[in-house]
Interface confidence: low
Amino acid sequence: ELCDDDPPEIPHATFKAMAYKEGTMLNCECKRGFRRIKSGSLYMLCTGNSSHSSWDNQCQCTSSATRNTTKQVTPQPEEQKERKTTEMQSPMQPVDQASLPGHCREPPPWENEATERIYHFVVGQMVYYQCVQGYRALHRGPAESVCKMTHGKTRWTQPQLICTGEMETSQFPGEEKPQASPEGRPESETSCLVTTTDFQIQTEMAATMETSIFTTEYQ
């Protein structure tokens, strides 16, 4: 089951995953004028064991004389979802493999890949938010959203972030370095929900292939 919608949209902010939980899928998309090779993989899949995670399959694109007919791949085709894009982002090597077991790094770019990446997130995935050019965060602490399963349904937690134009606010007087622990941050949740620490979120493993689409663009 797909996570409900995409991660929340915050005005004047962009978001990305720093690492991808096992079970995450990445579509093999090619740029215009290219297509996936015949018998080539439709997607890459983050798989692994307790000690090592990596992406299965390789995406390969080949020149195409006809219009690119690569289609969006979803784990469950009957549940198509709207594709959304974030700020242009360059290829990243996000998180130390050892620091987040059960997670894959950002896959390196492949030749002639499309300008946007379409991910299918699994429950437990965390994405981080950051204000874009010309805006500053009123809340100086961590800003993240986690895909959770609650009462049989999936949802993204609401990131605690407001981005305001730099002209609309003065410098932050007496800014203090926030604590590493984001405990106690409020969430707009119903009373039936159980609070979960970041550690629990990062270490819980999704038992099923519950995913959400997330698209990032490349420069």
Partner: nanobody, 127 residues
């Protein structure tokens, strides 16, 4: 822990250009906002420019706007500072710094909020 090593400094005439590089090793580079600061003899360390992990947020000090450009290459774990139209008052030791985005949701200009620092590279602009 992140280790930062700056390079590219040197002696240049006013109006000239330099490109500083900061190579990062250790923890994942893209998990950090990156900043450039400078310190002239007898003066406090001051903010020059910074970039968020996406490159979408790049504040500059007013004194360098339009002359300096910060960029990052997350595949090479490197952040750059392209400095054009250099002035004698740009003479200083330039430092690269990293700030964990797990702690922050925007790009800060405050030196104390950066977690890791390089040793610096000297830039001298002669008139």
């Amino acid at each position: 822990e992140v280790q930062l090593v700056e390079s590219g400094g040197g002696l240049v005439q006013a109006g000239g250009s330099l490109r500083l590089s900061c190579a990062a090793s250790g923890r994942a580079f893209s998990m950090y906002n990156m900043g450039w600061f400078r310190q002239a003899p007898g003066k406090e360390r001051e903010f020059v420019a910074a970039t968020g992990w996406s490159g979408a947020n790049t504040p500059y000090a007013d004194s360098v706007k339009g002359r300096f450009t910060i960029s990052r290459d997350n595949t090479q774990n490197t952040v750059y500072l392209q400095m054009n139209s250099l002035k004698p008052e740009d003479t200083a030791t330039y430092y690269c710094a990293a700030d964990s985005i797990r702690l922050r949701s925007d790009v800060t200009r405050i030196p104390l909020e950066y977690d890791y620092w390089g040793q610096g590279t000297q830039v001298t602009v002669s008139s």
